[in-house]
Interface confidence: medium
Amino acid sequence: SIPWNLERITPARYRADEYQPPKGGSLVEVYLLDTSIQSDHREIEGRVMVTDFESVPEEDGTRFHRQASKCDSHGTHLAGVVSGRDAGVAKGAGLRSLRVLNCQGKGTVSGTLIGLEFIRKSQLVQPVGPLVVLLPLAGGYSRVFNAACQRLARAGVVLVTAAGNFRDDACLYSPASAPEVITVGATNAQDQPVTLGTLGTNFGRCVDLFAPGEDIIGASSDCSTCFVSRSGTSQAAAHVAGIAAMMLSAEPELTLAELRQRLIHFSAKDVINEAWFPEDQRVLTPNLVAALPPSTHRAGWQLFCRTVWSAHSGPTRMATAVARCAQDEELLSCSSFSRSGKRRGERIEAQGGKRVCRAHNAFGGEGVYAIARCCLLPQVNCSVHTAPPAGASMGTRVHCHQQGHVLTGCSSHWEVEDLGTHKPPVLRPRGQPNQCVGHREASIHASCCHAPGLECKVKEHGIPAPQEQVIVACEDGWTLTGCSPLPGTSHVLGAYAVDNTCVVRSRDVSTTGSTSKEAVAAVAICCRSRHLVQASQELQ
Amino acid sequence: QEDEDGDYEELVLALRSEEDGLADAPEHGATATFHRCAKDPWRLPGTYVVVLKEETHRSQSERTARRLQAQAARRGYLTKILHVFHHLLPGFLVKMSGDLLELALKLPHVDYIEEDSSVFAQ
């Protein structure tokens, strides 16, 4: 039987012949920034190139004795998880190790920065194939660390990091908080978030996905044939680095944005027990456990989208929150969410030549989140069409009038402090394919996009009685690009996409005295690209 | 994930260069910011990453580092340039007294300075 963690990340079709996916990762070099490693361990011997790089602080304490097996333990285990002969994820991947952590597992931001620069310099001196950089470490939030990661990512390097073992918001740590880095939390064999003593895996919107990180069998530096079981978000990150190496070996031209979207797409959805997370973090934390793609799968034909949450705006009256997509992604829709329900909606804005999603807090509100739907769509061209508040009983509406443009998302923004005090429209028109409909006091923004073969449809789901949550999902073959509440639902907390499902949340109806006239309805915009489907059929 | 609005401490110092005759002195009111780790036990005062503005030329990193050393020496402080960055961010790593931060933040081309801090195996 194979270790539980390898079974968990392996698609069912591999399992018949045990864990023997192709000896993946052979075209990829994985740089490991960690402790020193035991390079002659049988798991990794011949797969690891120990670089000359070393930048570590002195060990603490005058009576500290350097013991090789202790000094090497963390890095050796992770090297084994990435590409170990028996217990590794990407058995064909090559590793290059840089020592940035001392024998006590401690390093510095500056030492790690110098290590990242070393990798960039190596890349310039001798360009190799795809590079994955594994950072199984964490420190406090660091602007310079995050900036360096951003630069390296923009040079075409895939960075994978541990979310952190502090049972805390990963956004408070670096490099976990860097948007360009793939940040990995840890789960166990029961798909529970990992508990580590009194602490455990970090969580929150800065985590991209989770991976196995408890009782992970791997190379032990105690001897060249020893194995040991270890736990932590480092182990989880090593799994994702291995999966990334496999994916990049199969498709070496993948960009970071494409790789991240594929990691999310092939993950197991909604298997983590969210009750472990603090209540206010549950909605922000992705319920995704990493997995390898099915062996033959070249997923290029799919329209991939992911949800990106902003930082919390804070409670001041004019506070705003901004959610941004990655460099190669397109913002196809924008929504907002507030736990108090006091918000003034959201809209798509241009910022530095790129579209961003901005949400607005309202007076007396505890703050808002902006939620961007970020998608990969070749040759896409989007614009926003806005209709000012209509003031009429029919509400405000706007449609995509440009030839060949389809509706991918609807946003609404209002200046009045509380839409609840303004009567909703008497009639609510049915959602029409290329049209957004909103409250008469709100300005409505339609995200209209053109791309080869792009087609979209609007799906509504309304519940006559008040509900705390209404969901509507896109069918197989369609991807959710937009998620918004229908007009007239004044007690709505907001809307957001979870995988391919649109969720509209309302205030707790028992405390709001709501009547059935204030029913909740959700509108999903589901898209697909006939162009991408045709391209994939030609490939096959 | 996190934009540059994380929960870290930021001290904004709007400072002008006191030095006369600096051809490349910052424009009036230009600000450089100082950052340090919000988790106090993880701070490493005495070592700082000085990050220069994005468009700064490669040779400017060494020049700015040398200028900091010269100005510090005139005030009786020893500094040590530990590393000059070229390939990711323009800037340098310097070992110096925290007393010199105000001086360093006034240097031309400086975008921000961050105090070094610890990272840990996870």
């Epitope: 075209l27 790089f53 070393e54 090559g94 310099k121 310039l124 001798q126 190799v128 | -």
Partner: antibody, heavy 118, light 108 residues
């Protein structure tokens, strides 16, 4: 014990070509990076080029582009240097060496002498 | 292209004396500088890597220092077997490997 052993040197006519071999033993060959360096009599060291372990990619000193070709055969644990259009000034001892990423050359062969003369 | 200038070209000293060889790079190279020793009829041997780290098996009398553009190799007390030629070497973008011209340490 890591060892590198060069062979294939000797006397060559001007305009001729030759192939030098470097046999490695003592460690896993396929994950190592190798480089060729030459040294003319009484002169300093001159880098020719290297071959990367990751993807087998090569990189050459501009001076040797088109003249030198580096290759490897992992099954034989052997590195090769093919030199064409040889001239008298190519007379030198040719060394193979292993490089680490940091590009220090930590193991060297004993060298093989190539003499280009008519 | 980076140029490495070693000085002096020749150093005449007696056993037991201290030898100091300098290597100056024409542009900033960080700490990516290595030192080698070569005896007549032998291949070079790695002494110091990354400016200051002794390679495996190298005696403690050999030390390296410097970063940026100026580097020093010091032999604290010359032994008879230390009389040889010493080369510095750096890696950079183009060409990736550059050697200095060498310093001959001879018996006075």
């Amino acid at each position: 014990q890591v060892q590198l052993l060069e062979s294939g040197g000797g006397l060559v006519q001007p305009g001729g070509s030759l192939r030098l071999s470097c046999k490695a033993s003592g460690y896993t060959f396929s994950r190592q990076g190798f480089t060729w360096v030459r040294q003319a009599p009484g002169k300093g060291l001159e880098w020719i080029g290297w071959i990367d372990p990751g993807n087998g990619g090569t990189r050459y000193n501009e001076k040797f582009k088109g003249k030198a070709t580096i290759s490897r055969d992992n099954s034989k644990n052997t590195l090769y240097l093919q030199m064409n259009s040889l001239r008298a000034e190519d007379t030198a001892v040719y060394y193979c060496a292993r490089y680490r990423v940091g590009y220090s050359l930590d193991y060297w062969g004993q060298g093989t002498l190539v003499t280009v003369s008519s | 292209e980076i140029v490495l200038t070693q000085s002096p070209a020749t150093l005449s000293l007696s056993p037991g004396e201290r030898a100091t060889i300098t290597c100056r790079a024409s542009q900033y190279v960080g700490s990516y500088l290595n030192w080698y020793q070569q005896k007549p009829g032998q291949a070079p041997r790695l002494l110091i890597y990354d400016a200051s780290n002794r390679a495996t098996g190298i005696p403690a009398r050999f030390s390296g220092s410097g970063s940026g553009t100026d580097f020093t190799l010091t032999i604290s007390s010359l032994e008879p077997e230390d009389f040889a030629v010493y080369y510095c070497q750096v890696w950079d973008s183009s060409p990736p490997v550059v050697f200095g011209g060498g310093t001959k340490v001879e018996i006075k």
